[in-house]
């Protein structure tokens, strides 16, 4: 499939101009190669009309230009003084005309409307409102006011001042007569339909002295905005429908065959199953505008999208709409990464998150997608050292392996951890990826005690048993904190006796804490890694208490009877700071991470699409 994309249809009127934008993957080769616009012949060839190398056909001399925008991966063809002869099938493309790196464009140039003299032209977008103004003279002030629509050869009454309304306009039309000072009446038509377009006549009085005014109503179907995004990337649709629909339900739908438009998401709580876990509808502003973010773009997401407002939360005739044509570029710069990661209860997962390697200094985030209301994604951890309180000791975001990938480790898994998670940064908003974590039956491979109590001033030894399948991996112990997990020295104590059917390659690796202090209290992880890639981890909470009797402590698995999440923290263990971060780029250049932390209320950190507050402390 060609990665070139442009408008499928371009419509214009004789004498006017058009501007056609074509998109291409902005590789260095593509940026510098020839760009062209050619007309398709009946026998299949394509005759160049204009190219980026300076060629301009005599047919286009003085009325067309082609401009390349290599930094955007686009080029634009402008054609002026259009005539009906320009109607036809064209291609915009890269390289040589016959190579197939092109996109087919149909250009339709129609005759301008033949209008009667003194005709007022009203050009209004589909779904919007038009006000047709009708002047009259004093002698007709008390007479019947009416509006007719020309259907074929005959005028058909639409509305009059005696209360008649044509059934096609019921509930969406009114006739206003201005105060006595103004000799004007107006007809207001709401929720305009394509079928409303045409010639109208307004009239005051019914005899030969009546006042008449011609009006031509043109209802414009919105031209779709072209959107070119990478496979596996993210797209944001910004929908601004105007304050008049601020309180009406909003929707985003995708056009299927014919005129059908299947709801993708709406503000009434509907969401298409194919978008589960990868869509957020950003709440509306007072002016009725909203935005929808879709991550993890798939080939099948390509197509025409409409956003609109209607009480039903779906497209109806007369809904005000905005349109986009989404092209998903399969020559993606976004690397493949697993869309599903499975973990066992009590065990752990390590998720690789891609980011734009040009933005290595950007802040990395991981959030949990929530489907309630319009969807939201409360932050769980960031690369600046913030971790949501409920995840202390079991969640870490690591900059490794770097060069366009960071790692998130989550351990002590429970069934509640199943769900969709988003990887994102405060840089390139297109690089948002989604991963689903599934919790399956099984046993963790690493064996550690449940929780451990150390005595001040004494020595503590904590074991971690590694099965033989991990023999080729580096084994480590580290102390968890909110910026990561700091490696600690550990001792290899030889083969472990904790595994059945496991040879000499199993290992018991112990963490030793000498002369325990209060600072040693906290979460410790043992784990395996291969270079910069992290594997399984297991967590142990070490509590520190006053000395009762002398000696050192050697913790065995037999003593490990407490559940992994039975952790008792001092009341002053973490002070919740009163800070806020707000980065408008994180959520489609608006309302991004609202991470307000308050000592009274706990905290909230979210890539948000709802207004509910997320309670619970945080650690910095």
């Amino acid at each position: 499939k060609s990665p070139i994309f442009g408008p499928e249809e371009v419509n214009s009127v004789e004498g006017n101009s058009v501007s056609i934008t074509c998109y291409y993957p902005p590789t260095s080769v593509n940026r510098h190669t020839r760009k062209y616009w050619c007309r398709q012949g009946a026998r299949g060839g394509c005759i160049t009309l204009i190219s980026s190398e300076g060629y301009v056909s005599s047919k286009y001399a003085g009325r067309a230009n082609l401009t390349n925008f290599p930094e955007n991966g686009t080029f634009v063809v402008n054609i002026a003084q259009l005539s009906q002869d320009d109607s036809g099938r064209y291609k915009c493309g890269l390289g040589i005309n016959s190579r197939g790196l092109s996109f087919d464009v149909s250009l339709e140039v129609s005759q301008g409307p033949g209008l009667l003299n003194d005709t007022k032209v009203y050009t209004v977008d589909l779904g919007r409102t038009v006000t047709i103004n009708c002047p009259f003279k004093t002698e007709n002030a008390q007479k019947r006011k009416s509006l007719y629509k020309q259907i074929g050869l005959y005028p058909v009454l639409v509305i009059d001042s005696s209360g008649y309304v044509n059934p096609n306009y019921t509930g969406r039309i009114r006739l206003d007569i201005q105060g006595t000072g103004q000799l004007l009446f107006s007809v207001v038509i709401n929720q305009l339909r394509l079928s409303d377009a045409g010639q109208y006549l307004c009239q005051a009085g019914d005899d030969s002295n009546s006042n008449k005014k011609n009006a031509d109503l043109q209802v414009l179907k919105p031209e779709p905005e072209l959107v070119y995004e990478d496979l596996r990337g993210s797209v944001t649709f910004h929908c601004a429908l105007g304050p008049e629909v601020a309180n009406v339900a909003k929707f985003l739908c995708r056009q299927s065959s014919g005129e059908n438009c299947d709801v993708v998401v709406n503000t009434l709580g509907k969401r298409a199953p194919a978008f589960e876990g990868r869509i957020l509808l950003n709440p509306q502003d007072k002016d009725g505008s909203f935005s929808v973010v879709i991550t993890g773009l798939r080939k099948e997401d390509a197509g025409r999208y409409l956003c609109g407002a209607h009480s039903d939360g779906q497209l109806q005739e007369g809904s005000p709409i905005q349109a986009w044509q989404l092209f998903v570029n399969e020559e993606s710069t976004i690397p493949r990464s697993p869309t599903v990661v499975k973990g066992v209860a009590g065990g752990s997962v390590a998720v690789l998150c891609p980011y734009n390697r040009k933005e290595s200094k950007s802040i990395k985030y991981w959030c949990l997608w929530e489907g309630a209301q319009n969807g939201r994604c409360p932050l769980l951890v960031d690369s600046e050292g913030w971790v949501k309180a409920q995840y202390e000791g079991r969640l870490s975001l690591l900059e490794e392996p770097g060069n366009g990938t960071f790692t998130v480790i989550l351990n002590q898994l429970t069934s509640r951890d199943a769900g969709f998670y988003w990887c994102l940064t405060n840089g390139d908003t297109l690089w948002r990826t989604t991963v689903e974590i599934k919790i399956i039956e099984g046993e963790p491979n690493l064996k550690v005690p449940g929780n451990v109590t150390a005595v001040l001033g004494e020595t503590l030894k904590v074991p971690c048993h590694f099965p033989c399948k991990f023999s080729s991996y580096e084994k480590y112990w580290c102390k968890w904190n909110n910026t990561g997990c700091q490696a600690l020295p550990s001792q290899d104590e030889g083969p472990s006796k904790a595994f059945v059917n496991c040879d000499e390659n199993s290992r018991l690796v112990s963490l030793t804490l000498n002369l325990v202090t209060r600072a040693d209290e906290g979460w410790y992880w043992c784990g395996v890694k291969q270079g910069h890639f992290y594997g399984e981890t297991a967590a142990v909470y070490v509590a520190v208490e006053e000395r009762k009797a002398a000696g050192s402590r050697d913790v065995s698995l037999a003593k490990a009877d407490a559940a992994p999440d039975e952790k008792v923290l001092d009341s002053g263990f973490r002070e919740i700071e009163n800070k806020a971060i707000q980065d408008p780029r994180l959520f489609a250049e608006e309302k991004a991470v609202a991470d307000t932390r308050d000592q009274a209320d706990g905290s909230r950190a979210s890539v948000d699409s709802g207004s509910s507050e997320e309670q619970g402390g945080s650690s910095r």
Epitope: P335, R336, S337, P338, T339, V340, V341, K342, G343, V344, G347, S348, V349, A350, L352, T407, I440, G442, N445, K469, Y473, V528, K529, Q530, G531, F533, Y534, G535, E536
Partner: nanobody, 124 residues
Framework: EVQLVESGGGLVQAGGSLRLSCAAS????????IGWFRQAPGKEREWVSC????????YYADSVKGRFTISSDNAKNTVYLQMNSLKPEDTAVYHC?????????????????WGQGTQVTVSS
């Protein structure tokens, strides 16, 4: 029953090439990872390369990067390790292994299923 069978090993001169195959059967899932490991006499087992079936991503140990290429034929349920520019230090028994769950990036995966191995000897 899950089975992994390696083939393609043999004796080759330094600078030569070999292609190892790992045929997998008995899997009821399609998102597993296959890794290649090697063990030289008297040495620890060493991870060489892996491929994630779910997304096609591939990884290599620094010692083989640029010389070895891992690939997969999903229709045949077979993973290949193309080894070029072989060196005497590549001499080992090469095992393929499968990570059936995929909780971790495949270089650090949990490999529960192992093949018997195929001997690769590189003479100088």
């Amino acid at each position: 029953e899950v089975q992994l069978v390696e083939s393609g090993g043999g004796l080759v001169q330094a600078g030569g090439s070999l292609r190892l195959s790992c045929a997998a059967s008995g899997f009821t899932f399609d998102d597993y990872a296959i890794g290649w490991f090697r063990q030289a006499p008297g040495k620890e087992r060493e991870w060489v390369s892996c491929i994630s079936r779910s997304d096609g991503s591939t990884y290599y140990a620094d010692s083989v990067k640029g010389r070895f290429t891992i690939s997969s034929d999903n229709a045949k349920n077979t993973v290949y390790l193309q080894m070029n520019s072989l060196k005497p230090e590549d001499t080992a028994v090469y095992h393929c292994a499968a990570d059936a769950i995929g909780s971790f990036p495949c270089p650090a995966g949990v490999y529960d299923y192992w093949g018997q191995g195929t001997q690769v000897t590189v003479s100088s």
